[in-house]
């Protein structure tokens, strides 16, 4: 069933997760600013195209519209997300020397998120019984292509999270 | 309640390597992240890496890069930390500490392994 | 990768006298979200670090209110306002901004 803004999670939670997603959008800011001054990839929408024959995932939070927000599927959501962009985050490793500091700070970072959401779900006695397994993550067959993976996935993460945050602020009204 | 709970002392000749095991329990194991951290001698806490062991990812920091490797059993709860060619600068003891976000991040740690490095 | 430098290395305090000890990073930690990813731990004799503070100013959990914490974006200071003989053992600094982690070289504090 449908539940409101009043439900049953705490405060604390909905501020650390608000904090946690304003982070990764600065490590997923970072990344996009170094893509496009090292190697001029400046525009996602550009390569929306090669994103599909790559096969790059959207993870979906349908579940979390303000209106009719069901708690326990938004949260089942929300990680799994989080879980599908480790996966993603983890298939550009070794995209380059100058970009690997701001992707491995940008990966444990989602998984964090993860972890936080995981615990909450688990107190409310949500959790899923077992990990969803990773699905078939992208293979990247040159440098070109995980780079401009990196510019795709830095943009759905981005996306992903605009819409996390305007959910979790929405939760966060009194 | 967490408990981290990690293998004996060591002693090792130079070249060798060792695989030092931190059990976890009291939690469910592979939903947070595992850190390794290094304490020479007299010395001060250095940061090894972590593994994610939902997606059996590791990352390092680049001094350790080449000669660790950090892996996790799910099925067991326990995390490892394998460091090879050792050399006497690697006597040192060894913690894991469990991951996370603001009041998460090493909350929680293991008791230390002491890893001696001796011809 | 982001330097801790901390001060002084040991610090020898009378039981019921205030402490203090400084830490400087390399790089500003605080994040545009408006936390700053400073942490304190604590290694008492013969035991595993501790989680003192966390983002720069907050009490973990069971740790005394004589402990508190405070800073800008790099120089950070942690007080504790009347010493205990609990209280001795080496205080770490550390950065959980960005990777790698860093840490303190630790200040050692002792009862005179």
């Known amino acids: 069933t449908p539940l409101g803004p009043a439900s049953s999670l705490p405060q604390s939670f909905l501020l650390k997760c608000l904090e946690q997603v304003r982070k990764i959008q600065g490590d997923g800011a970072a990344l996009q600013e170094k893509l496009c001054a090292t190697y001029k990839l400046c525009h996602p929408e550009e390569l929306v195209l090669l994103g599909h024959s790559l096969g790059i995932p959207w993870a979906p939070l349908s579940s979390c519209p303000s209106q009719a927000l069901q708690l326990a599927g938004c949260l089942s959501q929300l990680h799994s997300g989080l879980f599908l962009y480790q996966g993603l985050l983890q298939a550009l490793e070794g995209i380059s020397p100058e970009l690997g500091p701001t992707l491995d700070t940008l990966q444990l970072d989602v998984a964090d998120f993860a972890t936080t959401i995981w615990q909450q779900m688990e107190e409310l006695g949500m959790a899923p019984a077992l990990q969803p397994t990773q699905g078939a993550m992208p293979a990247f067959a040159s440098a070109f292509q995980r780079r401009a993976g990196g510019v795709l996935v830095a943009s759905h993460l981005q996306s992903f999270l605009e819409v996390s945050y305007r959910v979790l602020r929405h939760l966060a009204q009194p | 309640q967490v408990q981290l709970v990690q293998s004996g002392a060591e002693v090792k000749k130079p070249g060798a390597s060792v695989k030092v095991s931190c059990k976890a329990s009291?939690?469910?194991?592979?939903?947070?992240?595992m850190h390794w951290i290094k304490q020479a001698p007299g010395q001060g806490l250095e940061w090894i890496g972590y593994?994610?062991?939902?997606?059996?990812?590791?990352n390092y920091n680049q001094k350790f890069r080449d000669r660790a490797t950090l892996t996790a059993d799910k099925s067991t709860s326990t995390a490892y930390m394998e460091l090879s060619s050792l050399r006497s600068e690697d006597t040192a003891v060894y913690y894991c500490?469990?991951?996370?976000?603001?009041?998460?991040?090493?909350?929680?740690w293991g008791q230390g392994t002491l890893v001696t490095v001796s011809s | 990768d982001i330097v801790m430098t901390q001060s002084p290395l040991s610090l020898p305090v009378t039981p019921g006298e205030p402490a203090s000890i400084s830490c400087r990073s390399s790089?500003?930690?605080?994040?545009?979200?408006?936390?700053?990813?400073l942490y304190w731990y604590l290694q008492k004799p013969g035991q595993s670090p501790q989680l003192l503070i966390y983002?720069?100013?907050n009490l973990a959990s069971g740790v005394p209110d004589r402990f508190s914490s405070s800073g800008s974006g790099t120089d950070f200071t942690l007080k504790i306002s009347r010493v205990e003989a609990e209280d001795v053992g080496v205080y770490y600094c550390?950065?959980?901004?960005?990777?790698?982690?860093?840490f303190g070289q630790g200040t050692k504090l002792e009862i005179k």
């Open positions: 500490a469990r991951g996370g976000y603001g009041d998460s991040l090493f909350a929680y």
């Open positions: 009291g939690y469910t194991f592979p939903i947070y992240t």
């Open positions: 593994i994610n062991p939902s997606i059996g990812y590791a």
């Open positions: 790089k500003s930690l605080l994040h545009s979200n408006g936390i700053t990813y």
């Open positions: 983002q720069m100013s």
């Open positions: 550390a950065q959980n901004l960005e990777l790698p982690y860093t």
